[in-house]
């Protein structure tokens, strides 16, 4: 496979990763698929420094990240360990609130207007951030 050594056009490089910030909204699953089509993933926040970087770029706008608990426990889309990793939830979040009247609870995490995290209904059309790592071989699958 080939290694990506610089970020694609319209992506922002930071600490050996590339970030892309949407200008419109999609449901969490559609945002996740969009990032995958770009050979990326929804942003995985692993440090306070990365949190501040993303927060600076998205501003005070609800924005999806690559964290969900649709199958039970909270999981990052790239396999980063949730339990031992960085967290920045709002007070009393996540709460899996059922009172929204949309059916079910809240299974997808997003940045809120102050940057802290909240769980919300995955179907809400929020903006999103894609991330891909530099110097990572793009494991091209073998041809069948």
């Amino acid at each position: 496979g080939s290694e990506r050594t610089c970020c694609p056009v319209n992506w922002v490089e930071h600490e050996r990763s590339c970030y892309w910030f949407s200008r419109s909204g999609k449901a969490w699953a559609d945002a996740d698929n969009y990032c995958r089509l770009e050979d990326a993933h929804l942003v995985v926040v692993t440090s306070w420094e990365e949190q501040k970087f993303v927060q600076h770029h998205i501003g005070p706008v609800n924005t999806w990240m690559g964290l969900h608990d649709q199958n039970g426990p909270w999981k990052w889309v790239d396999g980063t360990d949730y339990e031992t990793g960085f967290k920045n939830w709002r007070p009393e979040q996540p709460d899996d609130w059922y009172g929204h009247g949309l059916g079910g609870g809240e299974d997808c995490a997003h940045f809120t207007d102050d940057g802290r995290w909240n769980d919300d209904v995955c179907q809400r059309p929020y903006r999103w951030v894609c991330e891909t790592e530099l110097d990572k071989a793009s494991q091209e699958p073998p041809l069948l």
């Epitope: 949407s22 419109s24 449901a27 995958r36 089509l37 770009e38 059309p125 494991q139 091209e140």
Partner: antibody
Framework: EVQLLESGGGLVQPGGSLRLSCAAS????????MSWVRQAPGKGLEWVSA????????FYADSVKGRFTISRDNSKNTLFLQMNSLRAEDTAVYYC??????????????WGQGTTVTVSS | DIQMTQSPSSVSASVGDRVTITCRAS??????LAWYQQKPGKAPKLLIY???SLQSGVPSRFSGSGSETDFTLTISSLQPEDFATYYC?????????FGQGTKVEIK
């Protein structure tokens, strides 16, 4: 000039297999997602499958999931569609298409001329 | 899946006419909509993306508008080469889906 050229279509019996190819030229193939779209005789367009630039991530219509496999060889600038367990309803002209992008992926901006697949006994 | 419904299914018009085709999505798709033109025996051609952005090389008589569920393709002054079938396509959610097509015929 940006070009896509499909090949591999033909007549195949129900339950049979076929592999379509799409040769790309005139652009940096590995940096673009690609797609297959089909059109049954006298019918409209139906999206079949898409694949990311590296080939790692793939997407399928429910009608072909588990039977068709999209792949690509970026060293040869070629897109593939492996079609197994073919059915009469898979009979169509198959087009490969490049996904254009500016800030977003926005649509299929370059299309091949199409290759005809006929599934019949 | 998101259903895309075009109307009318066909329209008869004369050269110079203003032609409007509508496309309705079964749920909101923001502006994730493209329009294509297809002539018999030929591959489709991208006309409009992001609901209202004109693809490079496409004549300015073509325009698109709308957002969420209701979209329009307008040909301001129909030319002989515009007689064709037009399709809308949503790219908001997989599976991507097309409208059933609108055939623009000579009156």
């Amino acid at each position: 000039e940006v070009q896509l050229l499909e090949s591999g279509g033909g007549l195949v019996q129900p339950g049979g297999s076929l592999r379509l190819s799409c040769a790309a030229s005139g652009f940096t193939f590995s940096t673009y997602a690609m797609s297959w779209v089909r059109q049954a005789p006298g019918k409209g367009l139906e999206w079949v499958s898409a694949i990311s630039g590296s080939g790692v991530n793939t997407f399928y219509a429910d009608s072909v999931k588990g039977r068709f496999t999209i792949s690509r060889d970026n060293s040869k600038n070629t897109l593939f569609l492996q079609m197994n367990s073919l059915r009469a309803e898979d009979t169509a002209v198959y087009y490969c298409a490049k996904l254009g992008k500016d800030y977003y992926y926005y649509g299929m901006d370059v299309w091949g001329q199409g290759t005809t697949v006929t599934v019949s006994s | 899946d998101i259903q895309m419904t075009q109307s009318p299914s066909s329209v008869s018009a004369s050269v110079g006419d203003r032609v409007t085709i509508t496309c309705r999505a079964s749920q909101g798709i923001s502006s994730w909509l493209a329009w294509y033109q297809q002539k018999p025996g030929k591959a489709p051609k991208l006309l409009i993306y992001d609901a209202s952005s004109l693809q490079s090389g496409v004549p300015s008589r073509f325009s698109g508008s709308g957002s969420e569920t209701d979209f329009t393709l307008t040909i301001s002054s129909l030319q002989p080469e515009d007689f064709a079938t037009y399709y809308c396509q949503q790219a908001n959610s997989f599976p991507w889906t097309f409208g059933q097509g609108t055939k623009v015929e000579i009156k």
